[in-house]
Amino acid sequence: LQDLCSNCPAGTFCDNNRSQICSPCPPNSFSSAGGQRTCDICRQCKGVFKTRKECSSTSNAECDCISGYHCLGAECSMCEQDCKQGQELTKKGCKDCCFGTFNDQKRGICRPWTNCSLDGKSVLVNGTKERDVVCGPSPADLSPGASSATPPAPAREPGHSPQ
């Protein structure tokens, strides 16, 4: 009897009520593997979720988040509010990155600017709330025999535009 069920392909289930005949999954259900005793209920993408891939008899629906939100967790199990670049999401909503930190995405947290001097490098482009610092070649005083005229500016001064 077990062998009969193992013959049931994906998209069907082994119907015990019908002498283990392979029956198609009912509407809004699926089985992604063969030999299933039941079909699983299709996921419904509602509210902040939107359908990325419709449910079929052999595969579950896949959800995305509506505009202004992004997926979190395996298989987009949650939607989290987007913020702007240069911000991070806190309990009180979206807040600008503090001085010395940046976020170049609509999600995630603000991260500290790269400290170029830790690697003995100069600053080519200053950091902003939206962008990390860009480091460049080692300045003269850190590179024997090298030559520069003006030392690199500090990473960024408040109110200054990006370098």
Epitope: V123, L124, V125, V134, C135, G136, P137, S138, Q163
Partner: antibody, heavy 122, light 107 residues
Framework: EVHLLESGGGLVQPGGSLRLSCAAS????????MGWVRQAPGKGLEWVSI????????YYADSVKGRFTISRDNSKNTLYLQMNSLRAEDTAVYYC???????????????WGQGTLVTVSS | DIQMTQSPSSLSASIGDRVAITCRAS??????LAWFQQKPGKAPKSLIY???SLQSGVPSKFSGSGSGTDFTLTISSLQPEDFATYYC?????????FGGGTKVEIK
């Protein structure tokens, strides 16, 4: 598409001055360091100077230090090279170039302008 | 200053040949090395940065390798448009320095 157009080259006498300009378009000018590289006739490439995105950091080759000044006007998307006390050995094609970076590090040149010829001769 | 020594200074090759150009730094520069191609009367064009990363739009027949002091630019199958002069540049430290160039000519 990034476009860099140099101007201001020409013939100048030894000891004279010249100011080169480089008009930039096709990218966020203030977000990139910029530089000048020169090439004497029939010779190789020689780095001249670099300026950071906001203009706060400047670096020069020893051969031009104290004579050349690099600057930029981010509101006009323009890079400059003021050249004073010019010498015969400064004769070269001067290229303006955007400084490339990947991730958080950079320092190579990409792309380059078409160049402007500076001839220092009496 | 970091000296960049390219070899050979010139080479003759045929269409379809595999060509390798080497660049040696006088001190370690990690992978802070770029390669450029220059054709007569034209501005240099960036091919490779970070020793081995292909610049956007550059054909994959160009490849770069190396780290520290020894670097190589390889053209897997030379085509007529590849006959040019090639330069390396270190951007590990100021002053930025270029190799003396390698002229690739038709045999």
């Amino acid at each position: 598409e990034v476009h860099l157009l140099e101007s201001g080259g020409g013939l100048v006498q030894p000891g004279g001055s010249l100011r080169l300009s480089c008009a930039a378009s096709g990218f966020t000018f203030s977000s990139y360091a910029m530089g000048w590289v020169r090439q004497a006739p029939g010779k190789g490439l020689e780095w001249v100077s670099i300026i950071g995105g906001g203009g706060g950091s400047t670096y020069y080759a020893d051969s031009v230090k104290g004579r050349f000044t690099i600057s930029r006007d981010n509101s006009k998307n323009t890079l400059y090279l003021q050249m004073n006390s010019l010498r015969a050995e400064d004769t070269a094609v001067y290229y303006c170039a955007k400084v490339g970076y990947s991730g958080t590090y950079g320092g190579w040149f990409d792309p380059w302008g078409q160049g402007t010829l500076v001839t220092v001769s009496s | 200053d970091i000296q960049m020594t390219q070899s050979p200074s010139s080479l003759s090759a045929s269409i379809g040949d595999r060509v390798a150009i080497t660049c040696r730094a006088s001190q370690g520069i990690s992978n802070y090395l770029a390669w450029f191609q220059q054709k007569p009367g034209k501005a240099p064009k960036s091919l490779i940065y970070a020793a081995s990363s292909l610049q956007s739009g550059v054909p994959s027949k160009f490849s770069g390798s190396g780290s520290g002091t020894d670097f190589t630019l390889t053209i897997s199958s030379l085509q007529p448009e590849d006959f040019a002069t090639y330069y390396c540049q270190q951007y590990n430290s100021y002053p930025l320095t270029f190799g003396g160039g390698t002229k690739v000519e038709i045999k």
